[in-house]
């Protein structure tokens, strides 16, 4: 079983966290798929992008997303210097000038065109279940993760340890 621990513990830490540099520490292109190997795809429709979760045909090419990793300090419970290490935050961009955004009011994940510096809604705390299995937690709404609902991406509240194992908030990253 996969698990993310301590959702309640770091609620304040996420709200108080600050990105330590304007530039990402690294960036790379990867395709994004669900834990059940469905692909996340992006389609331009009526001058806006739609996000789909679907099974691709055999030779269909997977869409790529530019993942930009940022370091974020968060407040300390124990360490004397007032910070307790770092978190990794990511932004996800499937095409130039467009980024995934958390719309917390609608519980939806949307693609927005915007300029840098990006708003907090475009940042997600990266949780690793393993090297290739990740979850994305909203910086603006701790305990809320990008997940899959009805073949679309949505924001899913993870409010207790039992729900942390849920496969619908787990994603795989791959180069192919």
């Amino acid at each position: 079983a996969f698990g993310i621990s301590g959702v309640q513990k770091y609620t304040r830490a996420l709200h108080d966290s600050s990105i330590t540099g304007i530039s990402p520490i690294t960036e790379y292109l990867a395709s994004l798929s669900t834990y059940n190997d469905q692909s996340i795809t992006f389609a331009l429709e009526d001058e806006s992008y739609e996000i789909y979760v679907e099974d691709l045909k055999k030779d269909e090419k997977k869409d790529k997303v530019l993942l930009s990793y940022y370091e974020s300090q968060h407040p300390s419970n124990e360490s004397g210097d007032g910070v307790d290490g770092k978190m990794l935050m990511v932004t996800l961009s499937p095409t130039k000038d467009f980024w995934l955004h958390a719309n917390n009011k609608e519980h939806s994940v949307e693609l927005h065109k915007c300029e840098k510096p990006l708003p907090d809604q475009a940042f997600f705390v990266l949780h690793n279940m393993h090297s290739n299995c990740v979850s994305f937690e909203c910086k603006t709404d701790p305990g809320v993760f990008i997940g899959v609902k009805d073949n679309h991406l949505a924001l899913i509240k993870v409010d207790s340890s039992e729900n942390l194992c849920t496969e619908n908030i787990l994603f795989k990253l791959s180069e192919t």
Epitope: D84, M87, S131
Partner: antibody, heavy 121, light 106 residues
């Protein structure tokens, strides 16, 4: 200041068991993945095992699978490595290592000083 | 499983020299690579993470670069205190170390 203190190493006969402990301080232990990495005398580093921050996921080097068990007690800031059916090739210094980022298995930063395990008859 | 191959195994250079250590992965590791320094009788120490980010407190003569399968650690001006073995470490898929490069002073 981050500190990792390993204990439990020693001389043990082949086939016997040993349990290593690592007590952590100076950071919020329950936020971090933890690792055991070993180094045979005069040799390179070898990743042995990993455990995620809540202990729900564990990973092992193929040659130790079924013999070694990693576990953690977040209330006591301690990570363990239970080593059963020890072999001479398990002889090494065993390091306890902290993940670099909260909630992430990407990168490792602080290492303990290591504890020597010698498997010999 | 991803294999990491470091070269050379031993590198001998003079104080002040620019030194380059290589690490090659068997598959693309997407810059998910660290470099560690280990001096005799000591635990390893993190120098560089995510290919090119200098760990706090590490001298700026150390730098990292690379992408895909090929990665490099550079010491711009070798100092006596840099005598050590250097290991690369990938965490893109599982966790694997290179076998190490021993750096000596001529």
């Amino acid at each position: 200041e981050v500190q990792l203190v390993e204990t439990g190493g020693g001389l043990v006969q082949p086939g016997r068991s040993l349990k290593l402990s690592c007590v952590a301080s100076g950071f919020t232990f329950s936020n971090y993945w933890m690792y055991w990495i070993r180094q045979a005398p005069g040799m390179g580093l070898e990743w042995v095992s990993s455990i995620n921050n809540d202990g729900g996921n564990t990973y092992y080097l193929d040659s130790v699978k079924g013999r070694f068990t990693i576990s953690r007690n977040n209330a006591e800031n301690t990570v363990y490595l239970q080593m059963n059916s020890l072999r001479s090739e398990d002889t090494a210094t065993y390091y306890c290592v902290k993940g670099h980022y909260s909630y992430s298995s990407y990168s490792i930063d602080y290492w303990g000083q290591g504890t020597l395990v010698t498997v010999s008859s | 499983d991803i294999q990491m191959t470091q070269s050379p195994s031993v590198l001998s250079a003079s104080v002040g020299d620019r030194v380059t250590l290589s690490c090659k992965a068997s598959h693309n590791i997407n810059k998910h690579l660290d470099w560690y320094q280990q001096k005799v009788g000591e635990a390893p120490k993190l120098l560089i993470y995510f290919t090119n980010n200098l760990q706090t407190g590490i001298p700026s003569r150390f730098s990292g670069s690379g992408s895909g399968t090929d990665y490099t650690l550079t010491i711009s001006s070798l100092q006596p205190e840099d005598v050590a073995t250097y290991f690369c470490f990938q965490y893109n898929s599982g966790w694997t170390f290179g076998q190490g490069t021993k750096v000596e002073i001529k």
